[in-house]
């Protein structure tokens, strides 16, 4: 990895061992320079592998609300608007970091957690399993 | 929102105002219960809107490495394996939380940051703009 010189103005770290506890400022800085208002907003409906978004709420997690995509069909939508089962709709998943309150119900103590979320769906050619 | 009683065993919070600084344990807990080994691994190649993954590295960020999807074509791959420009490949984007070292180069002090990443691509029907 890249070694970076430590800033002498850093706060003291009480625990140098891993697992380590760090200080995190929750005042979120939004670096999204992409100002395109449409973004993925209507793709869920226009996609050949359309999906619905489901609200997943957990007050013990930060962010407490995450939207999960579920593909509408196993097949993909063809040019006639019908489902074509020679193609497969599949979820595009991503591992993301969230903060989990630990101990539970604590407002200012968290643990990093990795969760798998489904962001949308894409249409793929099926894997053909050849029987010997 | 949902109000949860505070756990009396919580660490003290020095700053009760927002923006607030919280303690975060960086020993990541992996909650991925989905054991499907395939996941999205080969979808980028099999998709009708295929994409390439680009490594985005930033040592001042946690996680330092993020993979960004870039759609290979403007159109989508048809049944003959050719690009069909009557359909559009578009990136599926998601806002994710990362930790940004603040002050810079500090190993144990961070600020939450929201960034927009492209996770994969999907094939959509184009929006037709009618000229008056």
């Amino acid at each position: 990895g890249i070694t970076i010189p430590r800033n002498p103005g850093c706060p003291n770290s009480e625990d140098k061992n891993f697992p380590r506890t760090v200080m995190v400022n929750l005042n979120i800085h939004n670096r999204n320079t992409n100002t395109n208002p449409k973004r993925s907003s209507d793709y869920y409906n226009r996609s050949t592998s359309p999906w619905n978004l489901h609200r997943n709420e957990d007050p013990e997690r930060y962010p407490s609300v995450i939207w999960e995509a579920k593909c509408r069909h196993l097949g993909c939508i063809n040019a006639d608007g019908n489902v074509d089962y020679h193609m497969n709709s599949v979820p595009i998943q991503q591992e993301i970091l969230v903060l989990r309150r630990e101990p539970p119900h604590c407002p200012n103590s968290f643990r990093l957690e990795k969760i798998l979320v489904s962001v949308g769906c894409t249409c793929v050619t099926p894997i053909v399993h050849h029987v010997a | 929102g949902i109000t949860i009683p505070r756990n009396p065993g919580c660490p003290n919070s020095e700053d009760k105002n927002f923006p607030r600084t919280v303690m975060v344990n960086l020993n990541i807990h992996n909650r991925n219960t989905n054991t499907n080994p395939k996941r999205s691994s080969d979808y980028y190649n099999r998709s009708t809107s295929p994409w390439n993954l680009h490594r985005n590295e930033d040592p001042e960020r946690y996680p330092s490495v993020i993979w960004e999807a870039k759609c290979r074509h403007l159109g989508c791959i048809n049944a003959d394996g050719n690009v069909d420009y009557h359909m559009n490949s578009v990136p599926i984007q998601q806002e994710i939380l990362v930790l940004r070292r603040e002050p810079p180069h500090c190993p144990n002090s961070f600020r939450l940051e929201k960034i927009l990443v492209s996770v994969g691509c999907t094939c959509v029907t184009p929006i037709v703009h009618h000229v008056a």
Epitope: N45, N52, C71, G75, N88, P91, V128 | N36, K38
Partner: antibody, heavy 124, light 113 residues
Framework: QVQLQESGPGLVKPSETLSLTCTVS????????VSWIRQPPGKGLEWIGI???????DYNSAFKSRVTISVDTSKNQFSLKLSSVTAADTAVYYC??????????????????WGQGTLVTVSS | DIVMTQSPLSLPVTPGEPASISCKSS????????????LAWYLQKPGQSPQLLIY???TRQSGVPDRFSGSGSGTDFTLKISRVEAEDVGVYYC?????????FGQGTKVEIK
């Protein structure tokens, strides 16, 4: 507990529109989808269509031109409208909740809770 | 549309004895991406609405007794009751949820001998 209750007129004249309401309780509308299924007297089950959690719909092509499913979330009610009915539309009509499975990334078309059903007779 | 064919259409049973119902699909219900078979079984007791027993071929719905089991893959599926009880009488339906429209079998009537 989870409950679904169909209501509407038991008798509809041919060529008119059949209108039914399904009132639900005990589950979150934003998570679950609801299907309508019918069962002609002494016969099997026939899926009519579904309304997803976002208000989008998918219909059995056999009914597509004359069916509309909608939702009024403020009242926890789903509705089914079937136009231009004939005697062949005489059936018990059910609304049913589609199963929601966390960590499963497809909409589900198994129905895990059903209303008691309402008989609609098409006759002049 | 996918045709679901059940057999037998009528099944007289003796309490305590096993019973088996077959369901055949006109196309494979196995989804290659997750290796799941999109088949469910329902029981409609006399005068009641259907209730889900089994989904994804073999996963029992919560609260369903373990005397009910499902098996099969592709186009051929079976529902077994290891020891029939009096409360198991009614019409059993298989349903495929792979292809739209989602279709049901014609039903198998299970009754006590």
């Amino acid at each position: 507990q989870v409950q679904l209750q169909e209501s509407g007129p038991g008798l509809v004249k041919p060529s008119e529109t059949l209108s039914l309401t399904c009132t639900v309780s005990g589950f979150s509308l934003p998570s679950h989808s609801v299907s309508w299924i019918r069962q002609p007297p002494g016969k099997g089950l026939e899926w009519i269509g579904i309304i997803w959690n976002n208000g989008g719909t998918d219909y059995n092509s056999a009914f597509k031109s004359r069916v509309t499913i909608s939702v009024d979330t403020s009242k926890n009610q789903f509705s089914l409208k079937l136009s231009s009915v004939t005697a062949a539309d005489t059936a018990v009509y059910y609304c049913a909740r589609n199963m929601y499975i966390t960590d499963y990334y497809y909409e589900n078309y198994f129905m895990d809770a059903w209303g008691q059903g309402t008989l609609v007779t098409v006759s002049s | 549309d996918i045709v679901m064919t059940q057999s037998p259409l009528s099944l007289p049973v003796t309490p305590g004895e096993p019973a088996s119902i077959s369901c055949k699909s006109s196309q494979s219900l196995l989804f290659s991406e997750n290796q799941k078979n999109y088949l469910a079984w329902y029981l409609q007791k006399p005068g009641q609405s259907p209730q889900l027993l089994i989904y994804w071929t073999s996963t029992r719905q919560s609260g369903v007794p373990d005397r009910f089991s499902g098996s099969g893959s592709g186009t051929d599926f079976t529902l077994k009751i290891s020891r029939v009880e009096a409360e198991d009488v009614g019409v059993y339906y298989c349903q495929q949820s792979y292809y739209t429209p989602y279709t049901f079998g014609q039903g198998t009537k299970v009754e006590i001998k």
